[in-house]
């Protein structure tokens, strides 16, 4: 490590004094200090002498001696005060530039250490510092504004009390630059554009940044467009806007448009697609099957996607029957816009009733005409079952009628004892009827089937049960023969004696 003579950390002299600073190292040494007049430098191998025979306040500062060949990079320093009664400050720079949140050193060096107690920092002309200005002072280095903010870009003066009066330094201009967090922010509107040939169109590309130094351009299918730029400044951001106005669009205007902005941090781009069409269009579609089956009492949402240009002039949901002339309640119809040209229309049908099965149509209109999309809604019902005893062609027959949707399957059971419902332990015999006779099968209605079980003689201590089931559920009816005739047992209902 080099050694400085005199071997003191600070040296205080008067103006006009002779000052000699000698630095000695193992190898060659170099001096570094504030730029100031009247110094002469004399080097002799491993020592270097810095001297002046007429010190001025401008020689105030820290002088550092380094040994370039030292791998540890050691250095020694001495601070020189030249205490001029008329000049308490030596300002090393009149402009300081920092980024926001950095510490800003205002390099006004005190020329007399005795004055340290009475120093303060003010804005020019004795005005107070901006509120919340945190600063500290070092007589060797000056005032440091900590974590400087953009608003603190001001002109400052260092103030010292000398003999009861304030003496100001020359002013120091602080420029606090906004930190550029990245490439400029971009907006390109609209995000998508459709026009009929001959119509007017506008595309706006705008970019903003905390710093004014950035470029923005609009390109069409990789061709940069020459558009006049508008500039603005608000909300502490610089804005540059490019507006493309097309009075009468044609097919060559269609395609991809990109808004591109760049600064020192990099580049941002965003794109949109412009479609030019010959005439108005209106397309209806659904992601759902147009034929819907729902269990009675449950709910259903019917959804239609609409793609249209120009916008819709009208739309509605209509019930086309067959059960009643009721129409969907408007409050159950909902419209959401996915984007400018695509919309979703939803009809909510909560807790469906039998009379609400049928056809529902969504109709929409724009200058391109009318379009409709129709859903067919069939309700599913669990089977309802009834059994009667009759004679067909002279033979005793049990006749089971089952009604439901989808078409029910029928199974006959014979079991011992009198019971409302046969259980496994009681079952004597089971007959499946794979092809019951279909009595009625109309669209949107239940399917009614009939199954016949010919019984030569009714066993009086036994029960005959007709069971029907489909994908929704099952139903059954128990028939109990008694001596006076026969009893039928609908589940959980009264006995019936024909």
């Amino acid at each position: 490590i080099p050694v400085i003579e005199p071997s003191v950390p600070e040296l205080v002299v008067k103006p006009g004094a002779t000052v000699t600073l000698r630095c000695v190292g193992n190898g060659s040494v170099e001096w570094d200090g504030p730029p100031s007049p009247h110094w002469t430098l004399y080097s002799d191998g491993s020592s270097s002498i810095l001297s002046t025979n007429n010190a001025t306040f401008q020689n105030t500062g820290t002088y550092r001696c380094t040994e370039p060949g030292d791998p540890l990079g050691g250095s020694a320093a001495i601070h020189l005060y030249v205490k001029d009664p008329a000049r308490p400050w030596n300002v090393l720079a009149q402009e300081v530039v920092v980024f926001e949140d950095q510490d800003a050193l205002l390099p006004c060096l005190l020329t007399d250490p005795v004055l340290e107690a009475g120093v303060s920092l003010v804005r020019v002309r004795g005005r107070p510092l901006m509120r919340h200005t945190n600063y500290s002072f070092s007589p060797w280095h000056g005032f440091t504004i900590h974590r400087a903010k953009f608003i603190q870009s001001q002109d400052y003066q260092c103030s010292a009390l000398m003999g009861g009066r304030k003496v100001m330094s020359i002013s120091i201009r602080l420029k606090v630059q906004k930190v550029i967090p990245g490439p400029p922010a971009l907006t390109l509107v609209p995000a998508e554009l459709v026009r009929i040939r001959g119509e007017a169109a506008q595309i706006v590309c705008s970019a903003s940044s905390v710093d004014v130094n950035f470029d923005v351009f609009l390109q069409h299918n990789n061709t940069k467009l020459a558009i006049p730029q508008q500039s603005d400044f608000h909300n502490n951001r610089y804005q540059k806007v490019l507006t493309l106005n097309l009075d009468q669009v044609d097919f060559q205007h269609a395609g991809n448009y990109s808004c591109v902005a760049s600064n020192v941090q990099g580049k941002h781009s965003t794109s949109m697609f412009f479609r030019v069409v010959e005439s108005a269009y209106l397309n209806l579609s659904s992601e759902q099957n147009l034929i819907q089956e729902v269990t009675v009492g449950e709910g259903l949402n019917l959804k239609v996607m609409v793609e249209a240009y120009p916008g819709l002039q009208g739309f509605n949901w209509t019930y086309l029957g067959p059960f009643s002339d009721h129409q969907p309640e408007p409050k159950l119809a909902n419209a959401t816009t996915k984007d400018t040209y695509r919309h979703t229309f939803t009809l909510s049908l909560p807790r469906l009733k039998p009379s609400e099965a049928g056809r529902y149509s969504f109709l929409a209109r724009n200058p391109g005409g009318w379009r409709a999309l129709t859903f067919e809604l069939t309700l599913r019902y669990p089977p309802e079952v009834s059994v009667i005893w009759t004679f067909i062609n002279g033979s005793g027959t049990l006749l089971c009628a089952a009604s439901g949707y989808p078409q029910p399957n029928v199974t006959w059971l014979q079991c011992s004892g009198h019971t409302d419902r046969c259980d496994e332990a009681q079952v004597l015999q089971v007959w499946d009827d794979p092809y019951p006779e279909v009595l009625s099968q109309e669209p949107f209605h239940k399917v009614t089937v009939q199954s016949l079980l010919t019984v030569e003689t009714l066993e009086h201590n036994q029960t005959y049960e007709c069971r029907a089931h489909n994908s929704v559920g099952s139903g059954s009816w128990a028939f109990i023969p008694i001596s006076a005739g026969a009893h039928t047992h609908p589940p959980d209902e009264f006995l019936f004696t024909p």
Epitope: S120, V122, R125, R127, P128, L129, R131, H132, T133
Partner: antibody
């Protein structure tokens, strides 16, 4: 609402000192500076100096330098002005005033004033 | 120091009439860096502290009636009361906050004729 409430009237002998207080309420005390302004009987207004309630930084009018000290107590949101070596021409109403929102030395709120009479 | 002078010393104006007060600074209080005039106007009624009316030479303080307006630039400024009301009887001061020490004018007393 913003209020600056000052201490009561004082009668002092020449050569004595006086310390006037100014209690602030209704705003964040440390966000604004306080100036002191005085008005001799029947006379105009004279700015005495300012203090930053944020960091205690002060700037006094040159003619009062060495005789005036301004301080703040942020725990009680109170500003103080002490004037030493009183003379008869220091007889005046002393006002504390809040610096403007802009941090410039004009005043949007004032205390009610404290009459200091210096008389032998 | 910047010396502020006001004219007239006093004036009497009929109710509903216009009152005009002038203020002159010994050097410009226009800051070229922000193009602002560092001048304020205050109203002081007897036994009360001053009340801020105008700042930056022409900006009316919140809650101040719009009959009060300020104008001027550089060294010459004017406070105008467009239609004097009884409650406007007071002493009016201009103040420069351009440079330390921040000085006030001597005041202009406004009365009703």
């Amino acid at each position: 609402q913003v209020q600056l409430v000052q201490s009561g009237a004082e009668v002092k002998k020449p050569g004595a000192s006086v310390k006037v207080s100014c209690k602030a309420s209704g705003y964040t005390f440390t966000s604004y500076g306080i100036s002191w302004v005085r008005q001799a009987p029947g006379q105009g207004l004279e700015w005495m100096g300012w203090i930053s309630a944020y960091n205690g930084n002060t700037n006094y009018a040159q003619k009062l330098q060495g005789r005036v000290t301004m301080t703040t107590d942020t725990s009680t949101s109170t500003a103080y002005m002490e004037l030493r070596s009183l003379r008869s021409d220091d007889t005046a109403v002393y006002y504390c005033a809040r610096e403007s929102w802009f941090g410039e030395v004009f005043f949007d709120y004032w205390g009610q004033g404290t009459l200091v009479t210096v008389s032998s | 120091d910047i010396v502020m002078t006001q004219s007239p010393d006093s004036l009497a104006v009929s109710l509903g009439e216009r009152a005009t007060i002038n203020c002159k600074s010994s050097q410009s209080v226009l800051d070229s860096s922000d193009n602002k005039n560092y001048l304020a106007w205050y109203q002081q009624k007897p036994g009360q502290p001053p009340k801020l009316l105008i700042y930056w030479a022409s900006n009316r303080e919140s809650g101040v009636p719009d009959r009060f307006s300020g104008s001027g630039s550089g060294t010459d400024f004017t406070l105008t009361i467009s239609s004097l009301q009884a409650e406007d009887v007071a002493v009016y001061y201009c103040q420069q906050y351009y440079s330390d020490p921040f000085t006030f004018g001597p005041g202009t007393k406004v009365d009703i004729k």
